[in-house]
């Protein structure tokens, strides 16, 4: 039961995380105008990965897409790439994990195949989450660098009384959405990998040794279960318990083996 719960929860957490990564990537508020001493502004600027926007106090908002590819900073291109790779990997991971879910039956899919798929989707989620966290962090670092640079030249004199106040940008909501979403996807991926260990079939190709005791005879299989990752021999999960005897290891470590018949 615990494996099913871990796998199901991992799937749901990853699903929320990937939805968050998609949302963050599409959001316009990656960087927002720093309002420092001026909490109410007549013109408010904010920027995303795909377009920049201006909101006037009149309520009018105008957004302009970045219609150039070569003219954009390399860092912005890198962030875009990281976020897209994260979304693609996450989407593939979700697709794979749907078929890997224990609660979903697809033909006569073996446990080893489900274990493999669970591990694959888990790794995909981990990489997806890392891509999102990396993308958001790179953008945040770019903002911090630019922030201090523009603070250094905050007021540039233009002769006499004329001043140009430079617009500084600070962290936008999308950065926090991205960090949280990346973290959730990462956690979901780890949960899927943990669930995979519980799903993996055991090696059962031991020879049973018969011990004849006085009274009644019981056939024991010596030794506990050998943990398998599912990448070794493709042993089918068939166990015969004579007399219903079970080892302590089996009961504690692998309760999920008896979740279904």
């Amino acid at each position: 039961m615990a494996v099913t719960a871990c796998q199901g929860l991992g799937f749901v957490v990853s699903l929320i995380g990937i939805a968050g990564i998609i949302a963050a990537t599409c959001m316009d508020q990656w960087s927002t105008q720093d309002l420092y001493n001026n909490p109410v502004t007549a013109v408010f600027n904010y920027q995303g990965l795909w377009r920049s926007c201006v909101r006037e106090s009149s309520g009018f908002t105008e957004c302009r897409g970045y219609f150039t590819l070569l003219g954009l900073p390399a860092m912005l291109q890198a962030v875009r790439a990281l976020m897209i790779v994260g979304i693609v990997l996450g989407a593939i991971g979700l697709l794979v994990s749907i078929f890997a879910l224990k609660c979903i039956r697809i033909g006569s899919m073996e446990d080893s195949a489900k274990a493999n798929m669970t591990l694959t989707s888990g790794i995909m989620f981990i990489v997806s989450g890392l891509c999102a966290i990396a993308g958001v962090s790179v953008f945040a670092n770019m903002l911090v660098t630019n922030f201090w640079m523009s603070t250094a030249n905050m007021y540039t004199g233009m002769g006499g009384m004329v001043q140009t106040v430079q617009t500084r940008y600070t962290f936008g909501a999308a950065l926090f959405v991205g960090w949280v979403a990346g973290g959730l996807t990462l956690i979901g991926g780890v949960m899927m990998c943990i669930a995979c260990r519980g799903l993996a079939p055991e090696e059962t190709n031991y020879k049973a040794v018969s011990y004849h005791a006085s009274g009644h005879s019981v056939a024991y299989k010596p030794g506990g279960f050998k943990a398998s990752t599912g990448f070794g021999s493709n042993t089918k999960n068939k166990k015969i318990y004579d007399g219903g005897a079970r080892t302590e290891d089996e009961v504690q470590s692998y309760p999920s083996k008896h979740d279904y018949v």
């Epitope: 105008q33 001026n38 109410v40 502004t41 007549a42 013109v43 600027n45 904010y46 920027q47 920049s52 926007c53 201006v54 006037e56 106090s57 009149s58 309520g59 009018f60 105008e62 302009r64 233009m158 004329v162 001043q163 140009t164 106040v165 430079q166 617009t167």
Partner: antibody, heavy 118, light 113 residues
């Protein structure tokens, strides 16, 4: 077509307060800021502040904080400005205006003349 | 606060002549986010409220005759009337629409010879 109708001229005593109104029609009142502007022969046009009728948010020119109070009643599509502790310097024409692209004021009321007597 | 300085304070021209008036701001009114200048021009005739002529420094409001042209960027702006008409006699104000508090110039009074 949007239209702003302001209340009539006021003659008030020094030290008293006055409340003028600005009734909006022809547009969704709660969706646009209503700004107030003071005009005197000496000082020209001065921006007092604005109110967003949708949620009652206000933003004042520091010079008029404590002097002017902006309110709005969405049920009657009316904005109000109260000026307290009147002095001769408050004698002016007060306009209400609705904002537009570029934070400009496209629709204006006809103005309310306030005369402060000693 | 941003200070708006208009010049000249008054000017007299013959009908049909081209006229220009200047407006200078103490801070740049150019917004880097959309490359627009937040400067507005108004026309006010005696006994009337101001009338919007131009916003974003050069965008003419609908219904405003095309003889009115706004130009300039940053801190220096100009309103030009290509051929002055009798109905153009008024006071012209420029306004900072970029930073609170919004501020107006003292105005340029246009008179006819």
């Amino acid at each position: 077509q949007a239209y702003l109708q302001q209340s009539g001229a006021e003659l008030v005593r020094s030290g008293a307060s006055v409340k003028m109104s600005c009734k909006a029609s022809g547009y969704t009142f709660s969706s646009h800021n209503i700004h107030w502007v003071k005009q005197t022969p000496g000082q020209g046009l001065e921006w007092i502040g604005y109110i967003y009728p949708g949620n009652g948010d206000t933003n004042y020119n520091q010079k008029f904080k404590g002097k002017a109070t902006l309110t709005a009643d969405t049920s009657s599509s009316t904005a109000y400005m109260q000026i307290s502790s009147l002095t001769s310097e408050d004698s002016a024409v007060y306009f209400c205006a609705r904002d537009y692209y570029g934070n400009s004021f496209v629709y204006w009321g006809q103005g309310t003349l306030v005369t402060v007597s000693a | 606060d941003i200070v708006m300085i208009q010049s000249p304070s008054s000017l007299t021209e013959k009908a049909g002549e081209k006229v220009s008036m200047s407006c200078k701001s103490s801070q740049s009114l150019l917004n880097s986010g959309n490359q627009k200048n937040y400067l507005t021009w108004y026309q006010q005739k005696p006994g009337q409220p101001p009338k919007l002529l131009i916003y974003w420094a050069s965008t003419r409001e609908s219904g405003v005759p095309d003889r009115f042209t706004g130009s300039g960027s940053g801190t220096d702006f100009t309103l030009t009337i290509s051929s002055v008409q009798a109905e153009d006699l008024a006071v012209y104000y420029c306004q900072n629409a970029y930073r609170f508090p919004f501020t107006f110039g003292a105005g340029t009074k246009l008179e006819l010879k």
